[in-house]
């Protein structure tokens, strides 16, 4: 499917509008740092050449590909080098080294600013005067410090965003309209963000032939009645559009997803029964709604697995004739059957069965040998349950932030080296697993728990590559991303860890802790809490309870104090003194 | 503070049964969860069976399961280990722990208390 002008197709393919939309996210990607007015600038540079080609395919340098035209156009800057530093060599490579060369450089916890959200009246003004502009800017604000952001997921965030402002700012009470959305939308983005993350991280540092294989499960505990070639074509596309948005390539991955919702929605019989509803919407929420469909249900008289994969005198004939379709066809056949197990457990029993036949197919008598094999699955599958069943009962007995601080404290023994605020992210995200999945019932728990930690501890993995301190942190992160959550599970205190000498200062507070909302008072207490571990690795559950509830109560004492200043200068060395007694 | 005195040990044959117990002191017995961690010679300190407080969840390491049974008597202020079928793979040093709040964790840094141990020997 070739064309005279890349960049004319993606035009004419996408409209004006969306094709104006990626091309700000793809250099608000790479180009972090630079400002807004700058990004809009180049974008209506490529927007206007864009147009040139549309009119006239062979006019000049229209023949050019996306990734030389759009770097071409990123290597104008003229404050790169100050801005980006080594970052800046990338424009003297070619293409392709020079994409892989920014890709490279994208930094996935840029030092920006956190978002501060204006008074509704001065948004909504915003928003009433230069509504294209306000909606650039949430664009550019999102994909800068989000730089694997899945970009037509962010155009579909965008329009929600649009809509919410459209609807609120002539509501009655603005405020009560507003925020909620807002909030909603920030929690969503985050979520969507780091999913996306997992998925590049899975194509780039595990291969594609990873990313297949979590496809195939996903898909087919979605996709339980469809026939494994179908699952196989869908698997097929997916990869396909991750791979480009992944890798740089929005406006190629904009437009093949799109070409997948169509499949899916002109296919639905051979797919699922649940589609329905969401091929009956405009596009971005059409396809927002199939990658989020719910799980269809599952055919009513599929036969046992054993037959084919353990029963059968055919096992290994058909695994060494296509090894990987063998093992896809297995994966596809679980997975269906199973939606109440994570797919993180569905790879690892893949895992296993594969080998399992490795071995047992080079065996004198290889069916004796894999006769057992499903067998071997049980501790697999009880681990997973059994770490969700207990940490639900821990979160139900401590309450979500006192769940945290035990998740805090656990993995703080287990990486101590790792930075505190990395920690404290991690460890309150990793806390979040309890409202968000302990709810539900018994079918749906592991799914839902162990696939968000998987997501959760991509993110550490990601933060710690950037910055590396902890070899079991690497070790966990790089041997094998299926057993990412099992390694760091059963990671234990690290006995050679030198307990971080007690700095006064890190232990210091004043008055400006009054004002702080509840969760920025709360990440405060938690960074105390990882800082104290840092120092005494050792110390009891007891102990350390004790210290936290007498900070608790120190920092109540001094936010009602008339001179809140004085009593946190006179009660913070007390607090720091007893608490240093108390883990003595 | 807890104090964890392990008792019941000693030499037993193969397919025989010991039962260990555990007892602790401290008001707030109830409140623990109780686990049972071994430590053969020359081998790293290995996670056995675990209760949690109410005694409502148990879980066992792959090697012993079916064959031991952890209980707990919160009036008592004890926690117990029904040996049986043992085998010489068995023999180790056990080790009574505690960890406030726990469901029952498999992890041995989770538990701040142990007991000093008692020794376990299966002959062949």
């Known amino acids: 499917d070739t064309h005279k002008s890349e960049v004319a197709h993606r035009f004419k393919d996408l409209g004006e509008e969306h094709f104006k939309g990626l091309v700000l996210v793809a250099f608000s990607q790479y180009l972090q740092q630079c400002p807004f007015e700058e990004h809009v600038k180049l974008v209506n540079e490529v927007t206007e050449f864009a147009k040139t080609c549309v009119a006239d395919e062979s006019a000049e340098n229209c023949d050019k590909s996306l990734h030389t035209l759009f770097g071409d156009k990123l290597c104008t800057v003229a404050t790169l080098r100050e801005t980006y530093g080594e970052m800046a060599d990338c424009c003297a490579k070619q293409e392709p080294e020079r994409n892989e060369c920014f890709l490279q450089h994208k930094d996935d916890n840029p030092n920006l600013p956190p978002l501060v959200r204006p008074e509704v009246d001065v948004m909504c003004t915003a928003f009433h005067d230069n509504e294209a502009t306000f909606l650039k800017k949430y664009l550019y604000e999102v994909a800068r410090r989000h730089p694997y952001f899945y970009a037509p997921e962010l155009l579909f965030f965008a329009a929600r965003y649009k809509a919410a402002f459209a609807e609120c700012c002539q509501a009655a009470d603005k405020a009560a309209c507003l925020l909620p959305k807002l909030d909603e939308l920030r929690d969503e983005g985050k979520a969507s963000s780091a999913k996306q993350r997992l998925k590049c991280a899975s194509l780039q540092k595990f291969g594609d032939r990873a990313f297949k294989a979590w496809a195939v499960a996903r898909l087919s505990q979605k996709f339980p009645k469809a026939e494994f070639a179908e699952v196989s074509k869908l698997v097929t596309d997916l990869t396909k559009v991750h791979t480009e948005c992944c890798h740089g390539d929005l406006l190629e991955c904009a437009d093949d997803r799109a070409d997948l919702a169509k499949y899916m929605c002109e296919n639905q019989d051979s797919i699922s029964s649940k589609l329905k509803e969401c091929c009956d919407k405009p596009l971005l929420e059409k396809s927002h709604c199939l990658a989020e469909v719910e799980n269809d249900e599952m055919p009513a008289d599929l036969p046992s697995l054993a037959a084919d994969y353990v029963e059968s005198k055919d096992v290994c004939k058909n695994y060494a004739e296509a090894k990987d379709v063998f093992l896809g066809m297995f994966l596809y056949e679980y997975a269906r059957r199973h939606p109440d197990y994570s797919v993180m457990l569905l790879l690892r029993l893949a895992k296993a069965y594969e080998a399992t036949l490795e071995k047992c197919c080079a065996a004198a008598d290889p069916h004796e040998c894999y006769a057992k094999v499903f067998d071997e699955f049980q501790p697999l599958v009880e681990e997973p349950q059994n770490l969700v069943k207990q940490n639900c009962e821990l979160f139900e007995q401590l309450g979500e932030y006192k769940f945290q601080n035990a998740l805090l404290v656990r993995y703080t023994k287990k990486v101590p080296q790792v930075s505190t605020p990395t920690l404290v992210e991690v460890s309150r995200n990793l806390g979040k697993v309890g409202a968000k999945c302990c709810k539900l019932p018994e079918a749906k728990r592991m799914p839902c728990a162990e696939d968000y930690l998987s997501v959760v501890l991509n993110r550490l993995c990601v933060l710690h590559e950037k910055t590396p301190v902890s070899e079991k942190v690497t070790k966990c992160c790089t041997e094998s991303l299926v057993n990412r959550r099992p390694c760091f599970s059963a990671l234990e205190l690290d006995e050679a860890y030198v307990p971080k000498a007690f700095n006064a200062e890190t232990f210091t507070f004043h008055a400006d802790m009054c004002t702080l909302s509840e969760k920025e008072k709360q990440v405060k207490k938690q960074t105390a809490l990882v800082e104290l571990v840092k120092h005494k690795p050792k110390a009891t559950k007891e102990q350390l309870k004790g210290v936290m509830d007498n900070f608790a109560a120190f920092v109540e004492k001094c936010c009602k104090a008339d001179d809140k200043e004085a009593c946190f200068a006179e009660e913070g060395p007390k607090f720091v003194a007893a608490s240093q007694a108390a883990l003595a | 503070e807890v104090q964890l005195v392990e008792s019941g040990g000693g030499l037993v044959q193969a397919g025989g049964s010991l039962r260990l117990s555990c007892a602790a002191s401290?008001?707030?017995?109830?409140?623990?969860?109780m686990g049972w961690f071994r430590q053969a010679p020359g081998k790293e300190r290995e996670f056995v069976a675990t209760i949690n407080w109410s005694g409502g969840s148990t879980y066992y390491a792959d090697s012993v399961k079916g064959r031991f049974t952890i209980s707990r008597d919160n009036a008592k202020n004890t926690v117990y280990l029904q040996m049986n079928s043992l085998k010489p793979e068995d023999t180790a040093v056990y080790y009574c722990a505690a960890d406030l709040y726990g469901p029952g964790f498999v992890l041995s840094m989770e538990y701040d208390y142990w007991g000093q141990g008692t020794q376990v020997t299966v002959s062949s």
């Open positions: 401290g008001r707030t017995f109830s409140s623990y969860a």
